[in-house]
Amino acid sequence: EPPTACREKQYLINSQCCSLCQPGQKLVSDCTEFTETECLPCGESEFLDTWNRETHCHQHKYCDPNLGLRVQQKGTSETDTICTCEEGWHCTSEACESCVLHRSCSPGFGVKQIATGVSDTICEPCPVGFFSNVSSAFEKCHPWTSCETKDLVVQQAGTNKTDVVCGPQDRLRA
């Protein structure tokens, strides 16, 4: 009685259970009455990452420098190449097929999380007591200067974009 289902790492063909090819190898010939499945290693710059019955290996991803990409991890016969973005850039998608320049946080906003090769800059509004007067992909919100610790007084209040202006305390005339 021919099988209707096969074990793990096998596939059913011509009423026979054949072994799948291991990761890093492609199928040449299905198993037969006389032979095991015939598999061959993937070529240079090719891979297969699962137990399979593929007759062609997949090409490694190309990290195109014209798109701001570079190799983060070189592919093997069992894994694809992993691309990441050049310094100052990040991937536009999880597949990292192209890159865009890291976003800068405008004045009034500070960097909450610095961008990586795969994620953009995360900005946050500067809360009361903090400011940012530059457009930057690195600068956090800075705390207003504490005039008191310098024995000075606030002459001009700070905003989310400007620091306080400190000045000398008015002396009482005799």
Partner: antibody
Framework: QVQLQESGPGLVKPSQTLSLTCTVS????????VYWVRQPPGKGLEWIGM???????DYNPSLKSRLTISKDTSKSQVSLKLSSLTAADTAVYYC???????WGQGTLVTVSS | ELQLTQSPLSLPVTLGQPASISCRSS???????????LHWYLQRPGQSPRLLIY???NRFSGVPDRFSGSGSGTDFTLKISRVEAEDVGVYYC?????????FGGGTKLEIK
């Protein structure tokens, strides 16, 4: 449908090289393996060697030093070359696909001066 | 090189009677994948061999169910439940587990 056909000289002199061709139809040699078997008159079967779909070969150790099996996938042909022939190489030579029951009709090769 | 030894060499059988052929291997025919590549062929006079049984016990398509195969490891048997006139010829066991593939010496079945 699947067919295999052996061709070559019927008569070869001792010490010469035998060249046989197996021409196949109905399937691709890049996906299927083919082997050679021979049968001396009135005797049993002897496995000679095989050409795998992927291009590698396996030979019978008793013949390996005299044997070459190759293929031309585009011509759908598998070739057998056996050198330094003696009368003991006289046999019907068959090519066979390694699945199902696909045999050539066989070709008789006689080694004689 | 692996040897396959068949017995008997000659098997005279009465039509309609059962017949049995033994094939012994000099080493186990179980492959690393668990398959046992032991096969049976019938060669009628003037013809190329015809596959009857593959992988010990699987009847090839079109082969009558009076033919059956059994065995494991190194001992294998081909049985014909009721011999018919067309069953005459030489029976060969064959293995494709180990290179070189090999054939048994053959068993000649004839009608008494």
């Amino acid at each position: 449908q699947v067919q295999l056909q052996e061709s070559g000289p019927g008569l070869v002199k001792p010490s010469q090289t035998l060249s046989l061709t197996c021409t196949v139809s109905g399937f691709s040699l890049s996906r299927y393996s083919v082997y050679w078997v021979r049968q001396p008159p009135g005797k049993g079967l002897e496995w000679i060697g095989m050409m795998w779909g992927g291009g590698s070969t396996d030979y019978n150790p008793s013949l390996k030093s005299r044997l070459t099996i190759s293929k031309d996938t585009s011509k759908s042909q598998v070739s057998l070359k056996l050198s330094s022939l003696t009368a003991a190489d006289t046999a019907v030579y068959y090519c066979v696909r390694t699945d199902g029951d696909y045999w050539g009709q066989g070709t008789l090769v006689t080694v004689s001066s | 090189e692996l040897q396959l030894t068949q017995s008997p060499l000659s098997l005279p059988v009465t039509l309609g009677q059962p017949a049995s052929i033994s094939c012994r291997s000099s080493q186990s025919l179980a492959s690393s994948s668990g398959n046992t590549y032991l096969h049976w062929y019938l060669q009628r006079p003037g013809q190329s061999p015809r596959l009857l049984i593959y992988k010990v016990s699987n009847r090839f398509s079109g082969v009558p169910d009076r033919f059956s195969g059994s065995g494991s490891g190194t001992d294998f048997t081909l049985k014909i439940s009721r011999v018919e006139a067309e069953d005459v010829g030489v029976y060969y066991c064959s293995q494709s587990t180990h290179v070189p593939w090999t054939f048994g010496g053959g068993t000649k079945l004839e009608i008494k």
